[in-house]
């Protein structure tokens, strides 16, 4: 049976917590990705940004989980949800920012 949205979001948050806590060397070796607007369409935008990073096992599970939240197919080089590409940040910072936002959504009961 499908996983309830609240459970899926909780699992994504737990995965991001796991990434940030277990980070020893720079995450994804310092790869940089487009920062995203966290106010709308956060899951697809986050996936569109992170999907461009390959060969980084630490975020592969996150990429798969985000794929489950995004209703449309996302492929590398696609930026329809990003809207404005204004700055690139390290993946580590991206994950931290995303985690803070998703915790806020969870507290507010916004599960999808």
């Amino acid at each position: 049976s499908p996983v309830p949205p609240s459970t899926a979001l909780k699992e994504l948050i737990e995965e991001l917590v796991n990434i940030t806590q277990n980070q020893k060397a720079p995450l994804c070796n310092g790869s940089m990705v487009w920062s995203i607007n966290l106010t709308a369409g956060v899951y697809c935008a986050a996936l569109e940004s992170l999907i461009n990073v390959s060969g980084c096992s630490a975020i592969e599970k996150t990429q798969r989980m985000l794929n489950g939240f995004c209703p449309h197919k996302v492929s590398a080089g696609q930026f329809s949800s990003l809207r404005v590409r204004d700055t690139k940040i390290e993946v580590a910072q991206f994950v931290k920012d995303l985690l803070v936002h998703l915790k806020k959504l969870f507290r507010e009961g916004q599960f999808n």
């Epitope: 070796n29 310092g30 940089m32 980084c56 080089g77």
Partner: nanobody, 116 residues
Framework: EVQLLESGGGLVQPGGSLRLSCVAS????????MDWVRQAPGKGLEWVST????????YYADSVKGRFTISRDNSKNTLYLQMNSLRAEDTAVYYC?????????WGPGTLVTVSS
């Protein structure tokens, strides 16, 4: 294997100009999004600029907008960064990077020092 080699750094006075170059090999350059990233002494990495494969899109950090220009020559597998109106705070090692790759695949960097 991705290989990148930057050049063109040096010592320049405030207000001066430099043009950085980066020669790429080991991957299909003309379909790759490319970045310039810098690291000031004792600071973290800072994204500077990005250019799309087709040259249609160019993007800049607010700190360099209007002063720096990114460009590329796909026939020469070369990325450029024209830096004008240089300031002391632009002092850093500048790295050329194939977008979305880690530091192990970046070039060694070229040092830009802005000082009078």
């Amino acid at each position: 294997e991705v290989q990148l080699l930057e050049s063109g750094g040096g010592l320049v006075q405030p207000g001066g100009s430099l043009r950085l170059s980066c020669v790429a090999s080991g991957f299909t350059f003309d379909v790759a999004e490319m970045d310039w990233v810098r690291q000031a002494p004792g600071k973290g990495l800072e994204w500077v600029s990005t250019i799309s494969p087709s040259r249609r899109g160019t993007y800049y950090a607010d700190s360099v907008k209007g002063r720096f220009t990114i460009s590329r020559d796909n026939s020469k597998n070369t990325l450029y960064l024209q830096m004008n109106s240089l300031r002391a705070e632009d002092t850093a090692v500048y790295y050329c990077a194939k977008a979305y790759t880690g530091r192990s695949l970046w070039g060694p960097g070229t040092l830009v020092t802005v000082s009078s």
